[in-house]
C-alpha cells in the first residue's frame, strides 16, 4: 500500500509535470510565436484511456515529436530549450509511471493538435492530483 510520503512525492511530481506542460502551452500560445500555425498542423497521438499513472507511457512516447515540434518556436518563448524542457519532463514521467511494468500504450483513432494534446495531459495531471489530495 502507498505510504503518505510516497503519495506526497507522487503529488509533487505530478504538480511539477503539470507546471511544465502549462508552461509549454503558454509558450506556444504566445502571440509572438510566428510558428504557431505550422505547429498546429502536426498531429499528435492521444491515449485511448488515461486514468492511471501507467498510462503516462502514452505521453512518454510522444515526447520526442513534441520536442521536435517545439524546436520550431523561437527559444525565447520558453525559459528552457525544448531539449532540456522535454528531458526534465521525461525524467518525471519515468519516475511516475515506473519502469518495472511494461505497459503497451493504446492510442485513440483521432489525432490532436499540440494544444489539444497538452490540454489532455494537463487534465490528466489535475485529475490524478485531485484523487491524491
Amino acid at each position: 500500500a502507498p505510504t503518505s510520503s510516497s503519495t506526497k512525492k507522487t503529488q509533487l511530481q505530478l504538480e511539477h509535470l503539470l507546471l511544465d506542460l502549462q508552461m509549454i502551452l503558454n509558450g506556444i500560445n504566445n502571440y509572438k510565436n510566428p510558428k504557431l500555425t505550422r505547429m498546429l498542423t502536426f498531429k499528435f497521438y492521444m491515449p485511448k484511456k488515461a486514468t492511471e499513472l501507467k498510462h503516462l507511457q502514452c505521453l512518454e512516447e510522444e515526447l520526442k515529436p513534441l520536442e521536435e515540434v517545439l524546436n520550431l518556436a523561437q527559444s525565447k518563448n520558453f525559459h528552457l530549450r525544448p531539449r532540456d524542457l522535454i528531458s526534465n519532463i521525461n525524467v518525471i514521467v519515468l519516475e511516475l509511471k515506473g519502469s518495472e511494468t511494461t505497459f503497451m500504450c493504446e492510442y485513440a483513432d483521432e489525432t490532436a493538435t499540440i494544444v489539444e494534446f497538452l490540454n489532455r495531459w494537463i487534465t490528466f495531471c489535475q485529475s490524478i492530483i485531485s484523487t491524491l489530495t
Epitope: 505550422r38 512516447e61 520550431l72 503497451m104 492510442y107
Partner: antibody, heavy 118, light 107 residues
C-alpha cells in the same frame, strides 16, 4: 532506443522477386510511417514508397507501380517491401526509414543489399 | 511531381571553411524540406527538418534556411567528419523526392 533492423543481403536472378523486412523497436510501430528508399552503387537516393502501419495504406512512386508491394505485420512490428520482376538495374541497397508528417525521416535501417544477376 | 535540384553536385573545401549547398524545388513546398548526410557504406542521417530546425544531437554548425522553392544548408566551420554526401528531401507531397546529392570533398 529506436531501431530499424533490416533483413540480410539477397542475390536474385532476373525475373525473380525479393522481399526485404524491416523490424522496428523502441517505439509504437503504428505511430510512424515506414518509407522505402533505394540507392544503386555510386548513385543518389531514390524514394520508392511509403506505408502507414496503422491503416496499411500505401503509396508508391510511379516508377515502381505494379512491381512493388509494401505490407506489415503489426504483431511483430515489422514492415516488408517486395519487389517483383527484378532486373539488373534493381541491384541496389534498400533502406527503410520511419517518418512522421514534416519531421522527415528521423531513423533509418542499416540497409539491405539486393544483387540481381544471372 | 516535384523535382528537387541540388547545387553544386560536388564541392571541395578545407577544414574550417564555411560551406553552402542549395536546393531548388520545381514548385513551392513551404517549409517541407529536410537535409540528410550520408557517409560511404552508411545509411543517411537527418540533419535538418522543416527547412531550418535542428534535431537534438546535430552540431549547431549545421543550419538550414529558405522556404517555398529555394533552400540552403550551411556548415559554418567544416570539421573533418563533415566530408560526406548531402541530400535534400521534400516531404510536402507524394511522391517524395530527393535532390541528386552534393559530394563534399577535402581540398
Amino acid at each position: 532506443q529506436v531501431q530499424l533492423v533490416q533483413s540480410g543481403a539477397e542475390v536474385k536472378k532476373p525475373g525473380a522477386s525479393v522481399k526485404v523486412s524491416c523490424k522496428a523497436s523502441g517505439y509504437t510501430f503504428t505511430t510512424y510511417d515506414i518509407n522505402w528508399v533505394r540507392q544503386a552503387t555510386g548513385q543518389g537516393l531514390e524514394w520508392m514508397g511509403w506505408m502507414n502501419p496503422n491503416s496499411g495504406n500505401t503509396g508508391y512512386a510511379q516508377k515502381f507501380q505494379g512491381r512493388v508491394t509494401m505490407t506489415r505485420n503489426t504483431s511483430i512490428s515489422t514492415a516488408y517491401m517486395e519487389l517483383s520482376s527484378l532486373r539488373s538495374e534493381d541491384t541496389a541497397v534498400y533502406y527503410c526509414a520511419r517518418g512522421r508528417q514534416w519531421l522527415g525521416f528521423d531513423y533509418w535501417g542499416q540497409g539491405t543489399l539486393v544483387t540481381v544477376s544471372s | 511531381d516535384i523535382q528537387m535540384t541540388q547545387s553544386p553536385s560536388s564541392l571541395s573545401a578545407s577544414v574550417g571553411d564555411r560551406v553552402t549547398i542549395t536546393c531548388r524545388a520545381s514548385q513551392g513546398i513551404g517549409d517541407d524540406l529536410g537535409w540528410y548526410q550520408q557517409k560511404p557504406g552508411k545509411a543517411p542521417q537527418r540533419l535538418i527538418y522543416s527547412a531550418s530546425s535542428l534535431p537534438s544531437g546535430v552540431p549547431s554548425r549545421f543550419s538550414g534556411s529558405g522556404s517555398g522553392t529555394e533552400f540552403t544548408l550551411t556548415i559554418s566551420s567544416l570539421q573533418p567528419e563533415d566530408f560526406a554526401t548531402y541530400y535534400c528531401l521534400q516531404h510536402n507531397s507524394y511522391p517524395r523526392s530527393f535532390g541528386q546529392g552534393t559530394k563534399l570533398e577535402i581540398r
